[in-house]
């Protein structure tokens, strides 16, 4: 099993739609279950975007390039929720997302109709297939939701900006 999310980071505007893409290939001939999971940041990322990240976090991440203080922590230290799941042609939204314009399209892409402030975080595309427990079954994209200030100076470097 191989799962790939082509965009590692994405910036989108508040109240605008966005699509988080996900591709997968599998040796299994059985239908796959697609699940998108949301994980909050380990610590507040907005502070960093405004130039207020802690010196401790900065020094730690400089010392250890593999570890990111915003992204790397036990799930028990942050919020984890299922956004949506797709089995066959049936898409089911997680309890927290019921009533939102959210669906899974093109096999495994997550389509969000209107972004909210709390949507910033990590989105994991997880594929489950029978007979295939080798390889890579998930990949993630970091989504940052910004308000329309008219200024792009607030943006984190290396984020691809999507203004619809």
């Amino acid at each position: 099993l191989q799962v790939t999310v082509p965009d590692k980071k994405k910036v989108a505007m508040l109240f605008q739609p966005t699509v988080l893409r996900c591709h997968f290939s599998t040796s299994s001939h059985q239908p796959a279950v697609v699940q998108w999971k949301f994980k909050s940041y380990c610590q507040d990322r907005m502070g960093e975007s405004l130039g207020m990240s802690s010196t401790r976090a900065q020094s730690l991440s400089k010392r250890n390039l593999e570890w990111d203080p915003y992204l790397d922590c036990l799930d028990s230290r942050r919020t984890v929720r299922v956004v949506a799941s797709k089995q066959g042609s049936t898409v089911t939204l997680g309890d927290f997302y019921r009533g939102r314009e959210i669906t899974i399209v093109h096999d495994a892409d997550l389509q969000i109709g209107k972004l909210m402030w709390g949507d910033s975080g990590l989105y994991y595309c997880i594929i489950t297939t029978p007979d295939d427990l080798e390889g890579k079954n998930e990949d993630s994209v970091e989504l940052l939701v910004l308000g329309r200030t008219g200024l792009l100076a607030d943006l984190l470097p290396s984020f691809a900006v999507e203004i619809m």
Epitope: L1, V3, V33, Q35, N64, L65, E66, W67, D72, L74, D75, S76, V80, V82, S85, D95, I126, T128, L133, E134, G135, K136, N137, E138, D139
Partner: antibody, heavy 121, light 107 residues
């Protein structure tokens, strides 16, 4: 064939130290997150530590944090667990374990045979 | 951490019987639950993952079901070699946690 062989267990006094090793073969070790899981005398299974494939991220439960250190040598395909300030409640069979997927949330598809650590005066 | 609870520490059954072992998660874990079998003197062995998928080489008398917080592992026709301790585990969020185990005894 995936193989994982633990060693280094034994009898140690409270407050003592021990270093466990897990020699692996049959897979690309440097691709995988690796785990130490222990089984208490009451047969409860609990995770002890895990480490990212590159070794830069390590995680521990509060019960062992500050006393245990997980590390790896990707050139030698070996996982380690340095245990210090050992307590009687650390007495257990220690297993190294590997998930099925090299990246992603999946259960432990592969386990070593275990090495027994006994902490007793 | 998510707590996994197996309410029965022991279950007694006869060869040929159908037996079900239950596991309850302290919070929603979707379908990310695995079941392991541990025979005396051996390491745990993965049987079921993602609540209902049989791992490679596992006989089809072993099945799993459930989602959310309630999960069931079933052996449709118990064999003498199924004498073991069975553990559930959530693989939804780190740290992955295990149930306390259910020891299956053959009458």
């Amino acid at each position: 064939e995936v193989k994982m062989v633990e060693s280094g267990g034994g009898l140690v006094q409270p407050g003592g130290s021990l270093k466990l090793s897990c020699a692996t073969s049959g897979f690309t070790f440097s691709d995988y997150y690796m785990y130490w899981v222990r089984q208490t005398p009451e047969k409860r299974l609990e995770w002890v530590a895990y480490i990212s494939n590159g070794g830069g991220s390590t995680y521990y439960p509060d019960t062992v944090k500050g006393r245990f250190t997980i590390s790896r040598d990707n050139a030698k395909n070996t996982l380690y667990l340095q245990m210090s300030r050992l307590k009687s409640e650390d007495t257990a069979m220690y297993y190294c374990a590997r998930q099925g997927y090299y990246y992603g949330s999946s259960p432990f598809a592969y386990w070593g045979q275990g090495t027994l650590v006994t902490v007793s005066a | 951490d998510i707590v996994m609870t197996q309410s029965h520490k022991f279950m007694s059954t006869s060869v040929g019987d159908r037996v079900s072992i239950t596991c309850k998660a302290s919070q929603d874990v979707s379908t990310a639950v695995a079941w392991y079998q541990q025979k005396p003197g051996q390491s745990p062995k993965l049987l079921i993952y993602s609540a209902s998928y049989r791992y490679t080489g596992v006989p089809d008398r072993f099945t799993g079901s459930g989602s959310g917080t309630d999960f069931t592992f079933t052996i449709s026709s118990v064999q003498a070699e199924d004498l073991a301790v069975y553990y559930c585990q959530q693989h939804y969020s780190t740290p992955y946690t295990f149930g306390g185990g259910t020891k299956l005894e053959i009458k």
